[in-house]
Amino acid sequence: LRPPRVHNSEENTMRALTLKDILNGTFSYKTFFPNWISGQEYLHQSADNNIVLYNIETGQSYTILSNRTMKSVNASNYGLSPDRQFVYLESDYSKLWRYSYTATYYIYDLSNGEFVRGNELPRPIQYLCWSPVGSKLAYVYQNNIYLKQRPGDPPFQITFNGRENKIFNGIPDWVYEEEMLATKYALWWSPNGKFLAYAEFNDTDIPVIAYSYYGDEQYPRTINIPYPKAGAKNPFVRIFIIDTTYPAYVGPQEVPVPAMIASSDYYFSWLTWVTDERVCLQWLKRVQNVSVLSICDFREDWQTWDCPKTQEHIEESRTGWAGGFFVSTPVFSYDAISYYKIFSDKDGYKHIHYIKDTVENAIQITSGKWEAINIFRVTQDSLFYSSNEFEDYPGRRNIYRISIGSYPPSKKCVTCHLRKERCQYYTASFSDYAKYYALVCYGPGIPISTLHDGRTDQEIKILEENKELENALKNIQLPKEEIKKLEVDEITLWYKMILPPQFDRSKKYPLLIQVYGGPCSQSVRSVFAVNWISYLASKEGMVIALVDGRGTAFQGDKLLYAVYRKLGVYEVEDQITAVRKFIEMGFIDEKRIAIWGWSYGGYVSSLALASGTGLFKCGIAVAPVSSWEYYASVYTERFMGLPTKDDNLEHYKNSTVMARAEYFRNVDYLLIHGTADDNVHFQNSAQIAKALVNAQVDFQAMWYSDQNHGLSGLSTNHLYTHMTHFLKQCFSLSD
């Protein structure tokens, strides 16, 4: 639902996007994800900050927590206990890494309308959550786990060995947070709250990255993070389970690691509770092409967890690494032993399989030259999943329902024809037993969130349709967007092109390539966005292109695993190939082509600029990786193996940006990095700069003091303003 193209007579009332629009977030959209608390009820924070409970079936709603109560402790978040007796209120949010933060927590008693006094929670807390039933609390404070049977009780201290930067209990260390779990927590309640499983990460032997944080003091302070770079010593992980009913009668019980995993360095990748007395753990060899899923049962007589070899399921890749970005997680069926899981089929496409006894006997549920992306929910009779099957566009997402109660199973696309032009990229959120669900459409038109009946799929109501955004865009000249593909040497290169509003194929336009290109990523997606590149097309008349080359996701293993052990080669080649094809289209000014990217994209843009092709006049690298020896072990080794002589050291050395310093001589290069980047360390850009200086190559650079990998806040405005000036200068566009 983009505003319709207008006739010339109306064009004088329309205006182009401005950089200010982008930096102010003028055209940002809203989504509505219900906070489900039952099959038919959800919570939502109203515009005036009341926490409101909605009952879909009665149509009634009432405020369970007033904005006054929220404001009394400056709460920015809340969590209702499953028995609905208490709410935790979260304040003093203090960000740590990508997912982690600390906060102060207050417990509010809904029955008497007062905050719980006595045995208050310590501060700041690293993670806190309710049990799935009742109102037990688990929390992590100073790297140790505590348990409260009731909010007003004293806590039980479950672990005692927690130590900053050494031992992490119930929360991940840096590398597990960023590259494996993608969460701020590493503890999991069993379905009825009888048991609490948690991970212990021992970082004692991990090398530490240290960088200065300048702050406002006379002396900068040093940030130290145990951070395993490629080939370095990794964290040692153990999984324990505690009986929360009687924490003093039985200590934390360690869950055994499968023998074939324990024989060398390994990772824990995820934990899924099946029942209160059955748990599923996933493990991964350090060389990440072998994953083991282990189903463990509680042995009541010994109060231990038993993981029989017969309940170990091995997933192995012979052409790349195990899984996509992560190894997929199982979704168990009601029999509590069989499960559904996404992994590669014999043709090399990721599909849903049903595993009843062994992986070898898995029944393939979906198939085709497309990929199943996510399993949302399995009920007694239906399985809901998303895929990019519809009309063969890999950058779309639709929601499907497969009936599993009947034979043969029938498949229905729930979303394909709902708002066909406006909505081609969906996610979903399901209530208990999938009684109802919310669909959130991200585009390509203006996003819309709707509520649906889980049985009939009927739309019940619109939750958020972004009317204000739609009205605000009515007088904006938005760029045109098209998603198409190039067929080159048996490779399909999907691209998105963003064209100026008055695009004329007979004219010549400057071209900006925006690249990410990391393994298992996807940039060409049918989603709505009004962002910096929208402005560059709308106001500055540039053509912007995004290309998904080899190594990108959701188009089969051949494309995905093409970059295995060879990062920095084919991703760059495919961007260059696409640029050549764009030039052939006739509307690109080949003397004004630029490339830019952030993070992995900064790496690819740097290598593209240094490719010696002469295609690019200029380019920007924001927070680039410059050598894979500088990046995190878990991520890097997944795709590159180890930086050892007998493994892949040669390509580690060949694929650095520094090795190509000489080739930057004939391009304009802008290198940007935050000095407090915990993820892609400033070291990466420091080494590029050193190599360029040593090669006597001129370049431009900008650092952002005390900024991390996101370059947020005022730095964002400065960054985009600076990059805009650089590109306009490169393209000889007047300011």
């Epitope: 045995n119 505590y146 049977q149 009731r150 009780d153 004293p154 806590p155 039980f156 201290q157 479950i158 005692f160 009986d243 929360t244 009913t245 009687y246 924490p247 003093a248 009668y249 039985v250 200590g251 009541e300 007589d301 109060q303």
Partner: antibody, heavy 121, light 107 residues
Framework: EVQLLESGGGLVQPGGSPRLSCEAS????????LSWVRQAPGKGLEWVSA????????YYADSVKGRFTISRDNSKNTLFLQMNSLRAEDTAVYYC??????????????WGQGTLVTVSS | AIQMTQSPSSVSASVGDRVTITCRAS??????LAWYQQKPGRAPKLLIY???TLQSGVPSRFSGSGSGTDFTLTINSLQPEDFATYYC?????????FGQGTRLEMK
């Protein structure tokens, strides 16, 4: 009035296998976890084993794990401790104790009078 | 296992005196601590749980305080029936452990 009455103690040879019993009255038996706590002559107290109200959860001190088995018969309001492979260091007065505090704080608000188990050849 | 250390091991006092017994845990036990009284040839009797909560039927001259690792049992105005051995017990972690006991005897 809560009452707990232990029996089954006596002189046992090393390696012997006596079974202790504890008859309870005066409270809803199946609602409470029960424990065995022992006290060696002239020494302090040592928790031995516990069992949840339903009998599903059975818990042991490391010193007796694999040798002792706790059980209960809720229909007869009786708690048991099957002791196997007895050693001299198991010599003690064995108390049956009822858990008191309801929020999983492991305290014992009522105790039996104890039964002495002497392990000697 | 968490070790509980009581001090003193024994104390002599007179009727009417105020007596304080301390208990130290080798690791934090929050407030999960109980105090018991045991007389020769008898079973222990619960006096205090959750560090400071008086068990019903126990005289108010008994009081408990502390949290974390350091705890105190105080008997105000000692009575003849209070001469006994007192044990602290932690209920935070496996296994539940007792202090070695403090013998309170008549001066």
């Amino acid at each position: 009035e809560v009452q707990l009455l232990e029996s089954g103690g006596g002189l046992v040879q090393p390696g012997g296998s006596p079974r202790l019993s504890c008859e309870a009255s005066g409270f809803t038996f199946s609602s409470y976890a029960l424990s065995w706590v022992r006290q060696a002559p002239g020494k302090g107290l040592e928790w031995v084993s516990a069992i949840s109200g339903s009998g599903g959860g059975r818990y042991y001190a490391d010193s007796v794990k694999g040798r002792f088995t706790i059980s209960r018969d809720n229909s007869k309001n009786t708690l048991f401790l099957q002791m196997n492979s007895l050693r001299a260091e198991d010599t003690a007065v064995y108390y049956c104790a009822k858990e008191g505090y309801s929020s999983s704080g492991t305290y014992w608000d009522h105790w039996g009078q104890g039964t002495l188990v002497t392990v000697s050849s | 296992a968490i070790q509980m250390t009581q001090s003193p091991s024994s104390v002599s006092a007179s009727v009417g005196d105020r007596v304080t017994i301390t208990c130290r845990a080798s690791q934090g036990v929050s407030s999960w601590l109980a105090w018991y009284q045991q007389k020769p040839g008898r079973a222990p009797k619960l006096l205090i749980y959750v560090a400071s909560t008086l068990q019903s039927g126990v005289p108010s001259r008994f009081s408990g305080s502390g949290s974390g690792t350091d705890f105190t049992l105080t008997i105000n105005s000692l009575q003849p029936e209070d001469f006994a051995t007192y044990y602290c017990q932690q209920a935070n972690s496996f296994p539940p452990t007792f202090g070695q006991g403090t013998r309170l005897e008549m001066k």
